[in-house]
């Protein structure tokens, strides 16, 4: 078997709001993968996990199922977003998102993904990680390629 | 308005103990962890540790392990940092600071302690 | 640990001038940046948070800038109350530590 390679492209979008009674922050982030199969038989994507970390704790979780099937040296686009809540013992965090005085909120956070891969019975998996500035001040989408967006996010319990 | 209030300077002999203290207003006690730093005279300045008072989750610098010990008493929005064993070294100004996302926001007016005998 | 590294250690200038003080980490510390200044006998102040953003009261003539390892920070036109000695400090993660120190005086 050749190689499967995915490639994490990046932030696309990030849509924020808040409960300032809670001073909680809510970023659901849109991330892009690539995924290229380079065999000459067809690949089951079984599944993507994601799981977002703000300073070392993890703000969000997600899942997507039986996702798609990748054709013989073929590539796909997949976009998955992950639901994200900064609160309790990161609560000034609403101070910095909520700040008049500066344009960009840009905060830093650690994206992890693993894809889970599936051919002949045989399954296989491939782990990212990258740091990403996201902006929690205001609702931003980001210049990626245009992609299929697969909306069947089942957040992990 | 954010203040961060320490308690006097202080004159303390060779190996014994110094408790000073930081007294937060202003702003939710504990929505921000406190950071404690120390400088020698005319030197940078040093990290000792933090202390967040909405856990009570503290971190300390490897380097002061073992001498510095943060406490809080939250009824009074109040961290202490406690310096042991005493030596001519630990002769400096303490200095307390709000953690802000980036940066300390606000800094108490500084502890000054002198180890002599 | 990383290292903050800050140049130049001392800066001899005259009111008016324009200086800029830089601060190298040993590694990335993604925008985890601030800075300080401080007077004689006197608690440090925050200047500038995030390696870009002025805190609150902060003159226009200050600015931050820079990512990844490499940070500066710009005075322009220096007033007399702007004399006493700059810091950078990186909480990327702990122990947060804090360059040696910019000594701006008086030419």
């Known amino acids: 078997p050749r190689s499967i390679e995915v490639k994490y492209i990046g932030v696309k979008s990030a849509y924020v709001s808040y409960d300032a009674e809670k001073r909680t922050i809510y970023l659901n982030i849109t991330n892009t993968l690539n995924i290229t199969n380079n065999n000459y038989y067809s690949v089951e994507v079984e599944n993507i996990t994601a799981q977002v970390q703000f300073s070392k704790t993890v703000i969000g979780k997600a899942r997507l199922n039986n996702i798609t099937n990748i054709g013989p040296l073929d590539m796909k686009q997949i976009d998955y977003t992950v639901p994200t809540v900064i609160a309790e013992e990161m609560s000034y965090m609403y101070d910095f998102c909520t700040l008049l005085s500066i344009k960009v909120h840009n905060i830093v956070l650690m994206m992890q993904v693993t894809v889970t891969t599936a051919y002949f019975g045989h399954s296989e998996q491939i782990s990212q990680e990258r740091y990403q500035y996201v902006d929690c001040g205001r609702n931003t989408t980001y210049q990626l390629a245009q992609s299929e967006y697969l909306n069947v996010l089942q957040p992990q319990q | 308005q954010v203040q961060l209030q320490q308690s006097g300077a202080e004159l303390v002999k060779p190996g014994a103990s110094v408790k000073m203290s930081c007294k937060a207003s202003?702003?939710?006690?504990?929505?921000?962890?406190i950071e404690w730093m120390k400088q020698n005279h005319g030197k940078s300045l040093e990290w000792i540790g933090n202390f967040h008072p909405y856990n009570d989750d503290t971190k300390y610098n490897e380097k002061f392990k073992g001498k510095a010990t943060l406490t809080v008493e939250k009824s009074s929005s109040t961290v202490y940092l406690e310096l042991s064993r005493l030596t001519s070294d630990d002769s400096a100004v303490y200095y307390c600071a709000r953690y802000f996302y980036g940066g300390m926001d606000y800094w108490g007016q500084g502890t000054s302690v002198t180890v002599s005998s | 640990d990383i290292q903050m590294t800050q140049s130049p250690a001392s800066l001899s200038v005259s009111v008016g001038e324009t200086v800029t003080i830089t601060c190298r980490a040993s590694e990335n510390i993604y925008s985890s940046l601030g800075w300080y200044h401080q007077k004689q006998g006197k608690s440090p102040q925050l200047l500038v948070f995030?390696?870009?953003n002025l805190a609150d009261g902060v003159p226009s003539r200050f600015s931050g800038s820079g990512s990844g390892t490499q940070y500066s920070l710009k005075i322009n036109s220096l007033q007399s109350e702007d004399f006493g000695t700059y810091y950078c400090?990186?909480?990327?993660?702990?122990?947060?530590?804090f360059g040696g120190g910019t000594k701006l005086e008086i030419k």
């Open positions: 400090q990186h909480l990327w993660s702990v122990p947060w530590t």
């Open positions: 995030a390696a870009t």
């Open positions: 202003g702003y939710t006690f504990t929505t921000f962890p």
